[in-house]
């Protein structure tokens, strides 16, 4: 299992361990879900589900999610809240993850060009942490410059990747357009021909990044969309096989799947679509929208079912003097959201064949 190939078996893993985890996943045809966390509660829900499923997990903070982690009352001028929130989330996850006994990849999600000051802030924190501990604060980061030209996208990634590689840090990048909207990137009206990344584009990324370090993954577009999308989705995960083949032929390597790929915009996808992606080298699947809704359902159902017990601090159907503290205590109703979000993650771990891989 996974634990055999990791130097650090539990808690936040970095460097070679991240590379070995993704290599193992690719070889054994499973993918690791990446859960967007916005609070200690959502982080705990993900960690608990992964622990109970004997699975590794990726916890990631988006730009907006990081700002929320810091607190909605803080100004995000100069990406201040997003930087502080991401760092706070990282320290929180680093301190609590070992208690769950599973390997955790600590990641930051989509960073568009206009959000690069956020990336700079996280990277500075990584470098400071590296000086002190010999490893970066985060396991990995994502740059999403898919709105820019390929040339600018790749050159910006190269610039940052050189800094990251010095800390043996993983980079996820995106090329081609994933429809819908994500922090700072809105591709809802993208030209149809742009919804499928071309193999040549993917190879250009490989050619630029691989000489720096093998620690990178590519989110290529195959008709997928962020969020729940009402448009005419034509998901073609089998296209990822073309990317693997083209890069393999260009490089002349024997490895069947030289690329580490990422599945974005998976809400509403079928099990078979996920499996096709995973069989073709997908090692990470982003889960956000589905988890957000799952988290809500537990709280929603609790509030609806306990309506008569939460209308006032005292007084319920059992009597006018009966206290309602045990019903309105946040630890009770927030926990319900954790349970339903955890159940969704448990199901996803099964779908992605991650269950029992430790």
């Amino acid at each position: 299992g996974v634990e055999q190939i990791l130097k650090r078996k539990t808690g936040v893993i970095v460097g070679e361990d991240v590379h070995n985890l993704f290599t193992y996943a690719k070889e054994h045809k499973f993918a690791i879900p990446a859960i967007n966390v916005t609070s200690s509660s959502t982080a705990v829900a993900a960690l608990e589900a992964a622990r109970d499923s004997k699975s590794p997990i990726i916890l990631q903070t988006s730009n907006g999610g990081a700002a929320y982690f810091a607190g909605k009352g803080i100004s995000n001028e100069g990406q201040n809240a997003s930087i502080k929130g991401a760092i706070a989330a990282a320290h929180y996850i680093r301190s609590i993850a070992p208690a769950y006994g599973i390997p955790v990849v600590l990641h930051s999600d989509h960073c568009a060009k206009k959000l690069l000051p956020w990336f700079d802030g996280m990277l500075e924190a990584d470098e400071a942490y590296f000086k002190e501990h010999g490893e970066p604060l985060f396991s990995s980061h994502m740059l999403d410059l898919s709105e820019e030209t390929d040339e600018e996208n790749i050159s910006t990634c190269v610039k940052y990747f050189k800094r990251m590689a010095a800390m043996d840090q993983w980079l996820e990048m995106e090329i081609g357009i994933t429809g819908g909207e994500e922090d700072g990137v809105n591709n809802e009206n993208a030209d149809k021909e742009d919804l499928y990344t071309k193999p040549e584009q993917v190879y250009n990324v490989y050619k630029a990044l691989h000489p720096i370090s093998p620690n990178f993954s590519i989110a290529a577009a195959f008709g997928n969309c962020h969020g729940l999308y009402a448009g005419d989705i034509a998901l073609r995960p089998e296209i990822l096989a073309e990317h693997q083949k083209y890069t393999r032929e260009q490089v002349g390597c024997k490895e069947e799947k030289p690329l580490f790929l990422v599945f974005h915009g998976g809400s509403g996808s079928t099990v078979q679509e996920f499996h096709t992606g995973i069989d073709n080298g997908v090692v990470k699947v982003n889960l956000d929208t589905d988890c957000q809704y799952a988290y809500l359902t537990g709280i929603r159902d609790y509030v609806l079912n306990k309506k008569d017990y939460i209308m006032s601090p005292v007084g319920n159907p059992e009597g006018p003097e009966k206290p309602n503290k045990k019903f309105f205590d946040p630890r009770v109703w927030v926990r319900e959201g954790e349970k339903t979000m955890g159940a969704k993650i448990t199901k996803s771990l099964e779908t992605f064949r991650t269950t029992n891989t430790l």
Partner: nanobody, 119 residues
Framework: QVQLVESGGGLVQTGGSLRLSCAAS????????MGWFRQASGKEREFLAR????????FYADSVKGRFTISRDNAKNTVYLQMNSLKPEDTAVYYC????????????WGQGTQVTVSS
């Protein structure tokens, strides 16, 4: 637009095999995703299988996975559907379709070929 003509249909017994062919005309064949669909009498059109432009990637409907195999020969501008272990419920008109990489879904369709599986 790619023009498509299917062939290879016919009458076959349960458990038998058939190989359908779809000949495409048009210079863009090697940059298309090709697919097979079917429509049984009184039913909606059903997706069966897809294949990427070089043939590196395939995708199958659960109903035919393991029994049907899609392949293509770009030198001959032809896509195939090998159908094994046929059942009476496979009886339908089988259609070939093409999706250009600048299109969001299949947009070119053949006229279809009838497959009848007798018990």
């Amino acid at each position: 637009q790619v023009q498509l003509v299917e062939s290879g249909g016919g009458l076959v017994q349960t458990g038998g095999s058939l190989r359908l062919s779809c000949a495409a005309s048009g210079r863009t064949f090697s940059r298309t995703i090709m697919g097979w669909f079917r429509q049984a009498s009184g039913k909606e059109r059903e997706f069966l299988a897809r294949i990427t432009w070089s043939g590196a990637g395939t995708f199958y409907a659960d109903s035919v996975k393991g029994r049907f195999t899609i392949s293509r020969d770009n030198a001959k501008n032809t896509v195939y559907l090998q159908m094994n272990s046929l059942k009476p419920e496979d009886t339908a008109v089988y259609y070939c379709a093409a999706q250009g990489l600048d299109q969001r879904d299949f947009s070119s369709w053949g006229q279809g070929t009838q497959v009848t599986v007798s018990s």
